[in-house]
Every structure is written in structure tokens, then in C-alpha cells.
Amino acid sequence: EPPTACREKQYLINSQCCSLCQPGQKLVSDCTEFTETECLPCGESEFLDTWNRETHCHQHKYCDPNLGLRVQQKGTSETDTICTCEEGWHCTSEACESCVLHRSCSPGFGVKQIATGVSDTICEPCPVGFFSNVSSAFEKCHPWTSCETKDLVVQQAGTNKTDVVCGPQDRLR
């Protein structure tokens, strides 16, 4: 009696269980009563990542440099290419189909978390006692200069965008 189900890594065709093609190979012809399944390796820049009965391999993903992408891990006959973003850019989606430039933190704000290939820069306002006078994707808020440790006095108060200005102490005669 013809089978109604087949073992793992097999498929049912013409009332017969045929072996699936291994990852990295595509189906050329189904098995018969007298012959095994015929499979062929995927061509260059192609892959199949599962045991399959596909007649065509998939093309490796193209990491388009015009979209800010680069190859992180090159594909093989069994795996697809993995794209990531060039430095200074991050993915716009989980699938990482394109990238956008990392955001910079404006003066008065510092970097709380540096951007990665998949997440943007996180900025935070500089709290009292700290400042940032640049627009940057890397710079944290810097602490105001401590005039006292230099034996100086504050001549101009700091802000979230400027450092304090220190000056000499008035000497009483």
C-alpha cells in the first residue's frame, strides 16, 4: 500500500517517499521506483538553508552601499548574506533593509548611549554641573571645571552649554 506520510527529510510524491535535497542543493528530479532524488549544488551567490525540494536556489541578499549597508557575514550555499550598517549609520528596521545616519546630540545635550548598527544615539540633557558645547554622536556631558581644586574662583557661571570660567582670587592686602 502506498505511504500517506514520509520520514523526516523525505517528501511524498507520486505515492512514493523521496529524499529531500540537503541545504545548499536544489531539486533536479524526483526519485522514482528505480532512482534516487537528483539534487544539484546551488550556483554562486545562491543558497538554500533547509532540507528542500526547491527547483531554484535563492539569491544572496545584496547589501547596497547606496543604502548605507555593508556585508557583515557573507552568504554560503547554505546561508544568506547578513547585512549591517556602515559606521555612523543604523538600521531603519529589524530586517535592516536600509540605514540612516546616527543622530547627533545638540549643545546642552550629551550622549547617554552611543548608537549601534541597530539602534540610534540616545541623548540626555546635561544636568546642573555638566555641559556640552558641541553637536556630537559620541560626546557625553562634561563636568564643569572645578575652580577650587585649581585654587581659583568662579568668574562666570557654567550653563548646560558652557563650562565655568575660572579666575584668580582677589588678594586682600
Epitope: E44, S45, H60, Y62, C63, P65, R70, V71, Q72, Q73, K74, I82, T84, E86, E87, G117
Partner: antibody
């Protein structure tokens, strides 16, 4: 961000030698790393590559003569049994040398001299 | 794969134009995995062109890469004294083990 090669020195033929490429400012889990060499007065020669998951690929003539491995911040090139033909400056390069990325980083190279 | 670079040496006058050819024995990955490098004595190679035709950061627009598949050209127009160097093409392929460099072209500026 930088890559820096070290370990180059004068060795006698047959004495194994390991060169180390130390990286800083980026992660080896995000970049493939390539080894290239250049004999004095000669052209550039591609030796092999270690990708982000640690798979290694070698030039056909280099298989068995070189071994590439890595840790979290270093990439090693072992010359298994050096001959005088292996006298060269060895370069460590971030990324696939022919890829569509413009952010490749080359080290300054380390000189290996094989002589008896 | 074999990358054949021609000529092996070329002389150029200041202000002139130089073309270097790079022929691959098989198509490079995605038809554009071809880079051009410039090397001066005692220095590591410097990336000029990647993706067959994209100019690397800081490289003058006098350098131009063209081609696709297995045939590529580097053209240097308005040649300057500073362009005296050896130029290499480098190809990446579907199989990493095929990766390689061309034999190099020495550009001598008169």
C-alpha cells in the same frame, strides 16, 4: 579605531611563528578580518580571512601553511612551517578586501624574515 | 580566481591621463566586488575605489573606477606628481577562497 600587527621577527626555516593583529574601537563580531602579505619588492598576496562567526578561508596555495584564529580583540596568523619564501611584511585588514564597504582598515604591517 | 592587471608599468606626464585595466578570470561577487588600492614605498595600501566605481573618502575625483563583472578600469586624469605609486585591483568572489589581488601597476610620473 585601529588594527596593529605584531610578532614579526627573524626565524629559522621550519620554526612555527604566530603573528597577532590587535584591534581596537570595533568588534570582531561585526567584521571579517583578512591577512595579506607582501614580499620585499613584490606585489600584494591574499592569504586568508576569518569571518564574524569564526569560519576561515584560505588562498588555495596557503592551505595547510597558515592558520587563522581569533579571540574577542585579536586575530592570529600562524605560519606553520616557515620557508625563506615566507619572508614578507604581513598586513592585517578589517573587512573583505574587495567588498562594497569603504571603511576598510589596514595595519602598518609586521616584517617576518625567514633565514638560516 | 586570477586577476590580470595591465600594464605592469606606465609612464605619465603631469596633467596627463592613465588607464589601468584589471581582468578577472571569473565574475566578481555581485559584479561589483572590486576595489582599487594605491601603495607607496614603506606604506600600507590605501583604498581608492570600492564597489568598482565608488570613490573612497578623501580621494580626489581625478580617480575614476569603472567596469562590472570581470572587466574593470582605473582611470587617473590630470595626473599629479603625488600619484606616483603602485596600484592594485582586489577582487572578492562568491567563494572567499577565490579572493585575490592583481599583479600591480607602477605609475611613474614625469
Amino acid at each position: 579605531q585601529s588594527v596593529e600587527e605584531s610578532g614579526g621577527r627573524l626565524v629559522t626555516p621550519g620554526t612555527p611563528l604566530t603573528l597577532t593583529c590587535t584591534v581596537s574601537g570595533f568588534s570582531l563580531s561585526s567584521y571579517a578580518m583578512t591577512w595579506v602579505r607582501q614580499a620585499p619588492g613584490k606585489g600584494l598576496e591574499w592569504l586568508g580571512i576569518i569571518d564574524t562567526i569564526g569560519s576561515t578561508y584560505y588562498a588555495s596555495w596557503a592551505k595547510g601553511r597558515f592558520t587563522i584564529s581569533k579571540t574577542s580583540t585579536t586575530v592570529d596568523l600562524k605560519i606553520t612551517s616557515p620557508t625563506t619564501e615566507d619572508t614578507a611584511t604581513y598586513f592585517c585588514v578589517r573587512d573583505y578586501i574587495g567588498s562594497t564597504s569603504g571603511k576598510k582598515l589596514w595595519g602598518r604591517g609586521t616584517l617576518v624574515t625567514v633565514s638560516s | 580566481a586570477v586577476l590580470t592587471q595591465t600594464p605592469s608599468s606606465v609612464e605619465a606626464a603631469v596633467g596627463g591621463t592613465v588607464s589601468i585595466s584589471c581582468q578577472s578570470s571569473k565574475s566578481v561577487y555581485y559584479k561589483n566586488w572590486l576595489a582599487w588600492y594605491q601603495q607607496k614605498p614603506g606604506q600600507p595600501p590605501k583604498l581608492l575605489i570600492y564597489g568598482a566605481s565608488t570613490l573612497a573618502s578623501g580621494v580626489p575625483s581625478r580617480f575614476k573606477g569603472s567596469g562590472s563583472g570581470a572587466q574593470f578600469t582605473l582611470t587617473i586624469s590630470d595626473v599629479q606628481c603625488d600619484d606616483a605609486a603602485t596600484y592594485y585591483c582586489a577582487g572578492g568572489y562568491s567563494s572567499d577562497s577565490d579572493t585575490g589581488f592583481g599583479g600591480g601597476t607602477e605609475v611613474v610620473v614625469k
